[in-house]
């Protein structure tokens, strides 16, 4: 019995004065607690607790279930205990069959003994199966058998507590060990789509998938920079004992522009946390934005090809697209396709393929696109570069020599005089008059230039060259002169092609 110095409160004393007491089933249990400040007796075994306010605890006919710890407490909160074993050959174990173990922790198989003098108190597998090789345990007759460092592999392990009594092995009722996995990694989170674009009034619904080893993983949807509780719905699946999946679906039934923002799916367990975000953009109405991929003013050489390419953003998705030239709609030579196969894609590409363009095919080519909310268009001005062509070269009645040339860009006409029989005309002659004839309206077609010189300036036999040129090429026409006395005679003009 404990002893303390006088003046200090002392714990109660119990009779009989021993830490353990063994009685036989059917015998009397009589325990006396002596203390001036007696408060109560408490009996504990497994999860059961009983109290008695009498200082003498009497059980007339002891049963195995009276096995347990009897504690006497005084008004100072000091206590003293005695452990009573009620030996019952027919009931060697008291059991609480609920057996949960946390992975990597110890767990107690609660099968305390009613007789501490039996031997070989241990665990055995059910139906004669051996226990896992790495399973370690520590027996304690008053509490049960502690399994050390529970492994995930022990999940659903069937066990018995076992003792030897009079040379024979006696088994308790069976226990099934249910293992709670330890979190050894953060949850795996993913989202159905990384971004959403909606019109006002449409439903926003996004699903976050959380994967972990057990259902005790926590998850929630949060709005960035907001504490507002979001409405979410959960569904879950057990794909394996340690393979759990939850889907958390966030819904806004009628989205508004001010619902736009970043939403975070957050999950955490005892190991750590993980998150994934999705962006919501809500617009008051749909839109189309067109981006030309080439300059909208296009210059192309006669006979060459050109591709007119646009990219455009359209939301909702485009419903009608067309290319138009001179009020005619192209039925072929163009293609339209999404920029990506992504479900969230709003960007598209349209290409018009113009092949072997003629000088007459310059002009405005227009791309038109529409969706349920808006229409949009973009125009390309296509200029076809052509080598000058000399349309007319004449001596007029007033003695002027006139040369008319057409081409794009606008041709320049230079005049040269070649005296005598020289092949090369180098002496330039200044024109009297230069006019661009068709400058009214958009200059997509060939530009016509007229240039004139005064033939009276020529006093010798020779050749006059009219040379029309631009960035693409040049063409010449020639006037041959011969003098007979005082009369000037024009020999037939002719052209020479100069590539």
């Amino acid at each position: 019995q404990p002893s303390v110095s006088p003046g200090e409160p002392s714990p109660p004393s119990i009779h009989p004065g021993k830490s353990d007491l063994i009685v036989r089933v059917g015998d009397e249990i009589r325990l006396l607690c002596t203390d001036p400040g007696f408060v109560k007796w408490t009996f504990e075994i497994l999860d059961e607790t009983n109290e008695n306010k009498q200082n003498e605890w009497i059980t007339e006919k002891a049963e195995a279930t009276n096995t347990g710890k009897y504690t006497c407490t005084n008004k100072h909160g000091l206590s003293n205990s005695i452990y009573v074993f009620v030996r019952d050959p027919a009931k060697l174990f008291l059991v609480d069959r609920s057996l949960y173990g946390k992975e990597d922790n110890d767990t107690l198989v609660r099968c305390p003994l009613t007789d501490p003098e039996v031997t070989n108190y241990s665990l055995k597998g059910c139906q004669g199966k051996p226990l896992p090789k790495d399973l370690r345990f520590i027996p304690d007759p008053k509490a049960g058998i502690m399994i050390k460092s529970v492994k995930r592999a022990y999940h659903r392990l069937c066990l018995h507590c076992s003792v030897d009594q009079e040379g024979k092995s006696v088994l308790s009722e069976k226990f099934i060990l249910k293992v709670r996995p330890a979190f050894k990694a953060v949850p795996v989170v993913s989202v159905s789509k990384a971004s959403y674009l909606l019109r006002e009034g449409e439903e926003f619904t996004v699903t976050c998938t959380i994967k972990d080893v057990s259902s005790s993983v926590y998850s929630t949807w949060k709005r960035e920079n907001s504490q507002t509780k979001l409405q979410e719905k959960y569904n879950s699946w057990h794909h394996g004992d340690f393979n759990y999946e939850r889907q958390a679906t966030l819904t806004i039934s009628s989205a508004r522009v001010n619902d736009s923002g970043v939403f975070m799916c957050y999950a955490n367990n005892t190991f750590g946390s993980a998150n994934v975000t999705t962006t919501l953009e809500v617009v008051d109405k749909g839109f189309i934005n067109i981006f030309p991929m080439i300059n909208t003013t296009v210059f192309v050489n006669d006979g060459e090809n050109v591709d007119l390419i646009v990219e455009y953003e359209a939301f909702p998705k485009p419903e009608h697209q067309q290319w138009i030239y001179m009020n005619r709609t192209f039925t072929d030579k163009w293609e339209d396709y999404p920029k990506s196969e992504n479900e969230s894609n709003i960007r598209y590409v349209s290409e018009l393929h113009l092949t072997r363009l003629k000088g007459t095919e310059g002009g405005t080519y227009t791309f038109l696109v529409s969706n349920s909310d808006v229409n949009a268009a973009i125009a390309f001005n296509v200029y076809v570069n052509t080598k000058p062509e000399i349309l007319t070269y004449d001596r007029l009645v007033n003695g002027m020599l006139q040369c008319v040339a057409a081409g794009f860009p606008e041709p320049t006409i230079d005049w040269y005089f070649c005296p005598g029989t020289e092949q090369r005309c180098s002496a330039s002659v200044l024109p009297v008059d230069v006019q661009t004839l068709n400058s009214s309206g958009p200059p997509f077609g060939k530009l016509v230039v007229q240039s004139s010189i005064d033939s009276s300036a020529f006093k010798h036999n020779g050749t006059v060259e009219c040379k029309a040129y631009n960035d693409v090429g040049k063409t010449s026409a020639y006037f041959n002169f011969a003098f007979k006395g005082n009369n000037k005679e024009q020999i037939h003009p002719h052209t020479l092609f100069t590539p």
Epitope: D47, R156, S216, Y218, W237, G240
Partner: antibody, heavy 118, light 107 residues
Framework: EVQLLESGGGLVQPGGSLRLSCAAS????????MSWVRQAPGKGLEWVSL????????YYADSVKGRFTISRDNSKNTLYLQMNSLRAEDTAVYYC???????????WGQGTLVTVSS | DIQMTQSPSSLSASVGDRVTITCRAS??????LNWYQQKPGKAPKLLIY???TLESGVPSRFSGSGSGTDFTLTISSLQPEDFATYYC?????????FGGGTKVEIK
């Protein structure tokens, strides 16, 4: 010994509300998911709702979604079911049960009767 | 949602008989199939979880088997205390759902 004790049942008019409680003892309450299951008179069992051990995540049967709310107070070892907009078809014995999808519902309370009638 | 269909809805048997109850899921539910026993006026009691694991304290005459969509509860030798209603339940995916029940009566 694991014990679950439901309370809060009774007679309520259609459209009314009721809050059921389930007091738990004999185990570490916060370690276990908890469910409500109901049984209409003479009928089979119907799972109603489940809440995770931490209380952070909840699940509902379609028949009660938006009307019933499951919650728990781990400091008081108590599970709750707030039932709003009650209908005649919600008349049943309501059981609380311990457990999750992996190990089944291993402990049940004795049930509390909810009668929805005008 | 996964529907659970139990058959038969009721059966009559004698003590000592071997009794088999089947449960079919509307889609595959791996092994997450539980069986419960309920006696009149009492709460259900878990017999078997995860298709075939006997809950502690449940007599070994009860056994469960099956996989995918088809599952079976077998009572190898019916005892007087086994006359009750039996329910299957899937806990593979929420919402968890029960079968309609099988009432085992005395012949």
């Amino acid at each position: 010994e694991v014990q679950l004790l439901e309370s809060g049942g009774g007679l309520v008019q259609p459209g009314g509300s009721l809050r059921l409680s389930c007091a738990a003892s004999g185990f570490t309450f916060g370690n276990f998911a908890m469910s409500w299951v109901r049984q209409a008179p003479g009928k089979g069992l119907e799972w109603v709702s489940l809440i995770s051990g931490s209380g952070g995540n909840t699940y509902y049967a379609d028949s009660v979604k938006g009307r019933f709310t499951i919650s728990r107070d781990n400091s008081k070892n108590t599970l709750y079911l707030q039932m709003n907009s009650l209908r005649a078809e919600d008349t049943a014995v309501y059981y609380c049960a311990r457990g999750d999808g992996v190990n089944g519902f291993d402990y049940w309370g004795q049930g509390t009767l909810v009668t929805v009638s005008s | 949602d996964i529907q659970m269909t139990q058959s038969p809805s009721s059966l009559s048997a004698s003590v000592g008989d071997r009794v088999t109850i089947t449960c079919r899921a509307s889609q595959s539910i791996p092994t997450y199939l539980n069986w419960y026993q309920q006696k009149p006026g009492k709460a259900p009691k878990l017999l078997i979880y995860a298709t075939s694991t006997l809950e502690s304290g449940v007599p070994s005459r009860f056994s469960g088997s099956g996989s995918g969509t088809d599952f079976t509860l077998t009572i190898s030798s019916l005892q007087p205390e086994d006359f009750a209603t039996y329910y299957c339940q899937q806990t593979y995916s929420t919402p968890y759902t029960f079968g309609g029940g099988t009432k085992v009566e005395i012949k």
